[in-house]
């Protein structure tokens, strides 16, 4: 190989050992029979050399540094060449470095040809191995602007007082152009300006200077975004830290077209703007840091550009001004992420504060819009607390558990509407009365409606799920001892059409000791399947639950148990089932942990089924499924 550097080129070439590998044989640079591991070639020198091994790329790297002095004379602006040409260089991993020194008053602009640059963060790398490392200068201090790959949105970077640009090319890469040019500009009066150009939908992740280390104190950095007029942009902060400020405040400022309040100033912890049409600027402003404990300011953020949906031009009013203790959350449905670009799906408050989820609270009217390619990606969850603190005031008081009609006007599907019903401990209990009798969801007879009510204890220490219930069954009411949550869960968009079938009334009633009581009036046409709460996990320890089963005068009820034995094993106490005729009060008691369940039995009159659990051994829980069928009473049965 021969490398000759012209005297006035200001180029130095350095060949040195790369990162050490575990290769057995060492390799040397051979210059006129002399073996060395480092070679430096200065301007005006011409050197012939070879390598002592077959694959020097496994051992050596080459650095080509060109110093460009814009302080003492005119600057060589325009397209930057790779000098010496890559064809003259040995096939080693090579780094071209351009070190440009300029006056503080002069701005320097790096312009990148297509494909533009994509910034990457710590721990990442470029697929083709080609990377750009760009640094600036503040007085004598070097500031890392960022490291970049090809195929991105960054088209220009403006700095002042000097630039250090390093282009790293792997030994096998055929590239022979730098891919950028340098131009002079007037002073930019800040650390740097990064221009990011979007041609269509896409996203860009960008970072503050020195990331993940701290942004220089009291500095200003700007990103300019060029967005096609028909698209919308949203900013979200992926990661940030604030330093300890002594004077001034760290902030981000936006210049947004059409905004009457430019610049719009945001704290880093604020929700950042979304749904922006057209070009906009974002600036990061540091502060004067506490000398003793400066902390660090750093920011990593994402800009997402996508087509607006018809819905994003509509404003929806959600009126919660008359509601109490209610919160409405619009959030993404859980989905498997695909690897290709997925447009963002945002919900915006007052059209500008956009985020992937939004919680609205009671007491106000809220105006919301959507920036989303497909609104089925979102759903809505509502929580409402109905609590009673004074048992004398609430007793016999009733509340309707109905989804407000306002919610049906929103273009996103309702997933859950949860009512948390809270009562004073040991003073009051609750009764749920449905508008239409309910069916308990079981494997044997699943619910096939567009919604169900999920009833569960709302006492944090108690893991008790009464079950899932849907309209069209035989359960007339559910009484529960203490705090519960009732969740209306929808399963199909047809819920909007079926909404009239929903409706539960909750009343506060005198306290009773059983965990739950189900009042059941079987239908003559079908089997009523009933099962103990907490199915599959077992009825909680020492819990008692009852079913009040009405038998019409002209009918006979057949009570059948699904299994022969419950399989429960008790550690403390025993599990009992009591079947009591309501008319005669005669009762039969079955020890569920010791005896077989009764064979199918006929009841001519209304009866109770009560189950009282023991403290079961782990894995030997009490789960009971039974069903009731009605048959017409014949003369010989009475």
């Amino acid at each position: 190989f021969e490398i000759a550097l012209p005297r006035e080129s200001n180029i130095t070439v350095l060949i040195k050992l790369g990162t050490p590998t575990l290769l057995a044989k060492p390799c040397y640079i051979v210059i006129s029979k002399r073996h060395t591991t480092m070679l430096s070639i200065k301007p005006g020198e011409r050197i012939l050399f070879t390598f002592s091994c077959q694959s020097p790329e496994n051992h050596f790297v080459i650095e080509i540094q060109k110093n460009i002095d814009c302080m003492s004379g005119p600057c060589p602006f325009g397209e930057v060449q790779l000098q010496p040409s890559t064809s003259l260089l040995p096939t080693l991993n090579r780094t071209f470095i351009w070190d440009v020194k300029a006056h503080k008053s002069i701005g320097l602009e790096l312009q990148f040809s297509i494909p533009r640059l994509r910034q990457f963060g710590p721990g990442e790398s470029c697929p083709d191995g080609v990377t750009y490392s760009i640094s600036g200068r503040i007085d004598a201090t070097v500031v890392r602007i960022g490291t970049f790959c090809s195929n991105g949105t960054v088209s220009r970077i403006k700095m002042q007082e000097g630039v250090k640009m390093a282009l790293h090319l792997p030994w096998f890469h055929p590239r022979n152009v730098s891919g950028f040019s340098i131009a002079n500009r007037s002073s930019i009066k800040r650390l740097c300006i990064i221009e990011s150009v979007f041609e269509g939908e896409g996203s860009a992740t960008l970072m503050s200077a020195n990331y993940p280390e701290g942004f220089p104190e009291d500095e200003l950095m700007t990103w300019q975004f060029v967005i096609p007029a028909h698209l919308r942009a949203s900013v979200s902060f992926l990661n940030f830290n604030l330093s300890n400020c002594e004077r001034k405040e760290e902030r981000v400022e936006y210049y947004i077209p059409g905004s009457t309040t430019n610049p719009e100033v945001f704290k880093l912890e604020d929700k950042q703007p979304g749904n922006m049409a057209g070009n906009f600027n974002l600036s990061l402003q540091g502060c004067d840091q506490d000398a003793q404990n400066p902390g660090i300011l750093r920011l990593q953020f994402q800009v997402l550009v996508q087509h607006p949906q018809n819905e994003s031009n509509k404003i929806y009013v959600v009126d919660l001004s008359n509601e109490r203790a209610t919160s409405l959350t619009i959030e993404p449905r859980p989905v498997k992420q695909s690897r290709k670009f997925v447009p963002g799906c945002f919900v915006c408050l007052e059209s500008r504060t956009c985020s992937t989820n939004l919680t609205l609270t009671s007491g106000s009217k809220h105006k919301i819009s959507f920036l989303c390619d497909n609104l089925t990606r979102l759903w809505m969850n509502v929580e409402k607390n109905i609590s009673c603190t004074d048992h004398r005031y609430c007793q016999r008081k009733s509340y309707s558990l109905q989804v407000p009609s306002d919610i049906f006007h929103l273009p996103v599907e309702l997933h859950d509407f949860s009512w948390k019903l809270l009562v004073p401990k040991d003073r009051l209990s609750l009764v749920l009365v449905p508008a239409q009798k309910l069916q308990q969801h079981t494997h044997e007879k699943p619910c096939n409606t567009s919604f169900s009510y999920l009833v569960a204890s709302a006492i944090p220490s108690q893991d008790l799920y009464f079950g899932s219930f849907c309209p069209g069954g035989s359960i007339e009411q559910i009484q529960v001892k203490q705090n519960i949550s009732v969740t209306l869960r929808t399963f199909a968009p047809s819920f909007r059409q079926e909404a009239s079938r929903q409706g539960l009334t909750v009343s506060f009633i005198p306290y009773f000791k059983e965990e739950g009581v189900f009042t059941v009036t079987p239908d003559t046409k079908s089997k009523v399947y009933l099962r103990t709460p907490n199915w599959d996990r077992g009825l909680p320890s020492l819990t008692s639950v009852s079913w009040n089963i009405s038998v019409p005068r002209d009918q006979v009820a057949c009570l059948t148990f699904f299994k022969e034995r419950t399989g429960v094993v008790c550690q403390t106490g025993r599990a009992f089932m009591i079947i009591q005729e309501q008319r005669t009060r005669a009762e039969e008691i079955f020890s569920l942990d010791e005896d077989a369940l009764p064979k199918p039995r006929f009841h001519h009159h209304s009866f109770w089924v009560n189950i009282s659990n023991c403290s079961p051994a782990s894995g030997k829980q009490l789960d009971l499924l039974f069903w009731v069928t009605l048959t017409p009473r014949t003369v010989d049965l009475t």
């Epitope: 403390t572 025993r574 599990a575 039969e588 008691i589 079955f590 020890s591 010791e594 005896d595 023991c614």
Partner: antibody, heavy 126, light 107 residues
Framework: EVQLLESGGGLVQPGGSLRLSCAAS????????MNWVRQAPGKGLEWVSA????????YYADSVKGRFTISRDNSKNTLYLQMNSLRAEDTAVYYC???????????????????WGQGTTVTVSS | DIQLTQSPSFLSASVGDRVTITCRAS??????LAWYQQKPGKAPKLLIY???TLQGGVPSRFSGSGSGTEFTLTISSLQPEDFATYYC?????????FGQGTKVEIK
Amino acid sequence: EVQLLESGGGLVQPGGSLRLSCAASGFTFSNYAMNWVRQAPGKGLEWVSAISGGGGSTYYADSVKGRFTISRDNSKNTLYLQMNSLRAEDTAVYYCAKESITMVRGVMDYYGMDVWGQGTTVTVSS
Amino acid sequence: DIQLTQSPSFLSASVGDRVTITCRASQGISSYLAWYQQKPGKAPKLLIYAASTLQGGVPSRFSGSGSGTEFTLTISSLQPEDFATYYCQHLNRFPRTFGQGTKVEIK
């Protein structure tokens, strides 16, 4: 009135067999676990065996395991104790007793024998 | 199996005395303990269950206490009809055992 009446006691030679019966009245017999308890002359009470209300579970003291069998016929409201391979130390008054089912501090269980029969005497002697 | 030890085995007392009988279990039985009274030639009678709950119809001068391994039966003011033998029995699963008994005699 709740009552238990034992019968079937008597004199039997060592190695012999005897079957005790206990007739229940005044309560729903099948609802309750039942016990046999014995008392040797001049000695204390010794629990012998128990059976659950439905007859699905049986329990025995180590001293009688393998020799005695407890059973019940809920249709006849009767409790039985079949005693085989009798020994001199089985000589005692045998009582049948009903378990009470009560809930105490939220725990439902058998909490002692609330109804006893008057006893039947078994003498094992050659 | 759980062993129950009663103390004392014999106790002489007068009418009106306060009498305490102790029952010690070989392992913890929570409050699964019953007390019975037996008079000569008669069947035992349940006095107290669950260590401290008085059986219906039993005079309130009888009381029980304790939990775990230590239990006591107290007769606050001994009456003539209380002279009998008293047994404790553990109720903590089968096999069940009785204490050896405490005979309360007239002094």
